[in-house]
Structures are given as structure tokens and as C-alpha cells.
């Protein structure tokens, strides 16, 4: 079998949901010494980057300016060390937002409910679309999908304090082209008096994977690695 290098990690910097005409940035984290990185879009080569100096950088950023529906879709990346290529990264779905109109999000029975109550979100958009998406802020990868002509419902079932948070919805014209986001709806879930104090509020931190963790190896890092290697040999 043909030898390959380990697959790189592909990430979107800040978010994978990019408003139209704005810039998307994708990071491909491979390995120190990689002389070339390639970004592929829907199976075709999209862009190339050659880090300088290759031995000091473990990844690259690919910039996609002027986002539109032609650039929305599935991206992956590979890298090369010498003549040896890596396996392909996992696929990353890049979505263009702020297309066409703005949906309206509502919640029944209301935004303030008690733990255990059944809650349903309704997303309405009058222009032609059949797929609707509901996202919780800070959990943008957990997309719920629902279908309907002009309105879709998202039954949450009996809620707990873990459902607390801010929600938005989108209408979707295809998997990668979404409408403007709705205004946020904040769901407040109160529990029993004993439980309420213990229930953690859901943090709305940005998604942890939406960060580029590329590092530039310094001379000091190299010296420390060499020192560590020498120390290990002495201990043996």
C-alpha cells in the first residue's frame, strides 16, 4: 500500500457560517516541515499555500474573500512533506448566510417556562424555502432541521435548565445557502427551588473548534525539544 502522512485537521476560523460578501478563513493544520498545503472544494483543487519556512509552521490559513453561494459547500485539505502526501482531512461544510430574507422565530408557550414543560419553536419565512434550521448560540454545530412550506416547528419535548439560552433560526435554500438569521429568542427555564441553584447556566462560549490553533515553532522550542531528547537518553 502507498504510504501516506496522517490527515490534517481543517477548521473554520471564527465560524463556518459566513455572511455573503464577507471573508471566510479556513485553517489546515498539518505538520512542521510540510512544503505545500492544498485546499479542495467539492473534490476540486481550490487553493494552494506554501509555508515559509516550512519547518517552522504546522499549518496554514486559506482565505476565501467575497463569500457567495458558488463558494459554499464541502472543503477538505491535504499537505505534502517532500514527495509524500497526507491523507485527506475530514470534510468541512462552509455555509453562506444572509441570503434573501429574514425569518421570524417564536416559541410556545412562551420564552419563560418551567423545567419539564413541553416547548416548541416556530420558524417562519414567507419566501420559497422548504428547510428550516434552529441553532442555539454557543452550540452552532448542533443544528436542528425541520421542513415546511412557510413555517417549520421544532418540538423540544420536556425542557430542562440545559435548554436555557438564546436561539436563532434560518431558512435554507440548499444545504449551504441560508437566509439572514432571525432575531434571537432567549429561552429561560426555571427549575424547582432546590434544583435551580444547582443547575448550571449554559455557557454561550464560542464553539471551541472554531479556532485556528496554528503554531510557529521558535528556536527556543527546538532547543527545549533537543534538551528533552538529550535528557531522556541520559536517563536511559
Amino acid at each position: 500500500p502507498k504510504q501516506t502522512l496522517p490527515k490534517p485537521i481543517i477548521r473554520a476560523e471564527s465560524t463556518y457560517m459566513v455572511p455573503k460578501e464577507k471573508q471566510a478563513t479556513l485553517c489546515c493544520q498539518g505538520s512542521y516541515g510540510a512544503v505545500e498545503y492544498q485546499l479542495h472544494f467539492e473534490g476540486s483543487l481550490f487553493a494552494v499555500e506554501r509555508p515559509k519556512p516550512p519547518e517552522r509552521i504546522n499549518g496554514v490559513k486559506f482565505h476565501i474573500p467575497d463569500m457567495n453561494s458558488r463558494k459554499a459547500g464541502r472543503y477538505s485539505c491535504i499537505y505534502r512533506v517532500g514527495e509524500l502526501w497526507s491523507e485527506r482531512s475530514d470534510l468541512l461544510d462552509l455555509v453562506v448566510t444572509e441570503m434573501y430574507d429574514t425569518p421570524t422565530l417564536s416559541v410556545h408557550p412562551g420564552p419563560e417556562v418551567t423545567s419539564g414543560e413541553k416547548v416548541t419553536f416556530y420558524c417562519r419565512l414567507d419566501t420559497a424555502t422548504s428547510m428550516f434550521l434552529l441553532l442555539k448560540e454557543g452550540r452552532s454545530r448542533d443544528v436542528q432541521r425541520s421542513y415546511g412550506k412557510v413555517q417549520a416547528e421544532f418540538p423540544m419535548g420536556p425542557v430542562t435548565t440545559a435548554h436555557r439560552g438564546s436561539y436563532r433560526c434560518f431558512g435554507s435554500y440548499n444545504n449551504y445557502a441560508w437566509s439572514f438569521p432571525s432575531e434571537p429568542v432567549k429561552l429561560l427555564v426555571t427549575g424547582d427551588i432546590e434544583n435551580t441553584s444547582l443547575a448550571p447556566t449554559d455557557p454561550t462560549f464560542p464553539d471551541s473548534w472554531d479556532t485556528c490553533l496554528l503554531t510557529r515553532e521558535t528556536g527556543l522550542q527546538k532547543d527545549l525539544a533537543l534538551w528533552d531528547h538529550t535528557a531522556q537518553n541520559l536517563l536511559r
Epitope: 471573508q23 472544494f41 476540486s44 483543487l45 481550490f46 487553493a47 494552494v48 499555500e49 506554501r50 515559509k52 496554514v60 490559513k61 486559506f62 482565505h63 476565501i64 474573500p65 467575497d66 458558488r70 463558494k71
Partner: nanobody, 126 residues
Framework: EVQLVESGGGEVQPGGSLRLSCAAS????????MGWFRQAPGKEREFVAA???????YYAESVKGRFTISRDNAKNTVYLQMSSLRAEDTAVYYC????????????????????WGQGTLVTVKP
């Protein structure tokens, strides 16, 4: 708004050379990544060569070693030097730009480019 105007096309014999030029208007040229594409009659537009804002280059396999892309930021112009031309190089050649860009990405996919020229015809025949 960026405008791109190609020139330098014409008729040449197999084995001959041509240099295409693409003049860009606007002050954003130095921050633009540039590329050349071509479209032969009855075929799809295909990538030929590209250059990043930091002068890194990438070529289609079919032209590697025969074509050279370069840029002159002072003149707001990108060039395609074509040598050892073959009949299969006959096509309309288009210049394209990605504006703005950051870093030194070289763009290969036509969807990446947001500005295009009108094209210049290159005909290779005996």
C-alpha cells in the same frame, strides 16, 4: 471595482511563443491574487496558471515548463509567457483576480475569482 484588460493574443505557429498581458485598474492590485484561465471552443473553462500576492506560482500540468506567470506591481500588470506552443493551446485566455487577499494563497478554482477580463484569443496553427 477592478477592471482587467488582456492583450497579446494572436496567431502563432506550433513551437512558437507569445506573451499575454493583463492590465488591472485600481489601487488594489498589489493585494490581489491573479490567475490565467482558458476556454477552447466547445470546452469548459480551465485553469492555466496563478500567482499569489507574494509571487508564489502554480501551473496546470499541461503547461508546466512551457508557460510562466509573473507580475509587475508597479505597472499593475500580470503576464503569461507562453513558449513551445501546441495546437491544443488554442483558446480564449482570460485573466482573473481575487480581491482582496491576505497571506500568500494561490487560487486555482475559478469560483475563487471575483473579477474577470474579457479574454484574448490565442490560435496555434501551422
Amino acid at each position: 471595482e477592478v477592471q482587467l484588460v488582456e492583450s497579446g493574443g494572436g496567431e502563432v505557429q506550433p513551437g512558437g511563443s507569445l506573451r499575454l498581458s493583463c492590465a488591472a485598474s485600481g489601487r488594489t492590485f498589489a493585494s490581489a491574487a491573479m490567475g490565467w484561465f482558458r476556454q477552447a471552443p466547445g470546452k469548459e473553462r480551465e485553469f492555466v496558471a496563478a500567482i499569489s500576492r507574494s509571487d508564489d506560482t502554480y501551473y496546470a500540468e499541461s503547461v508546466k515548463g512551457r508557460f510562466t506567470i509573473s507580475r509587475d506591481n508597479a505597472k499593475n500588470t500580470v503576464y503569461l509567457q507562453m513558449s513551445s506552443l501546441r495546437a491544443e493551446d488554442t483558446a480564449v485566455y482570460y485573466c482573473a483576480a481575487v480581491v482582496p487577499t491576505y497571506g500568500s494563497n494561490i487560487y486555482v478554482h475559478s469560483a475563487a475569482y471575483n473579477y474577470w477580463g474579457q479574454g484574448t484569443l490565442v490560435t496555434v496553427k501551422p
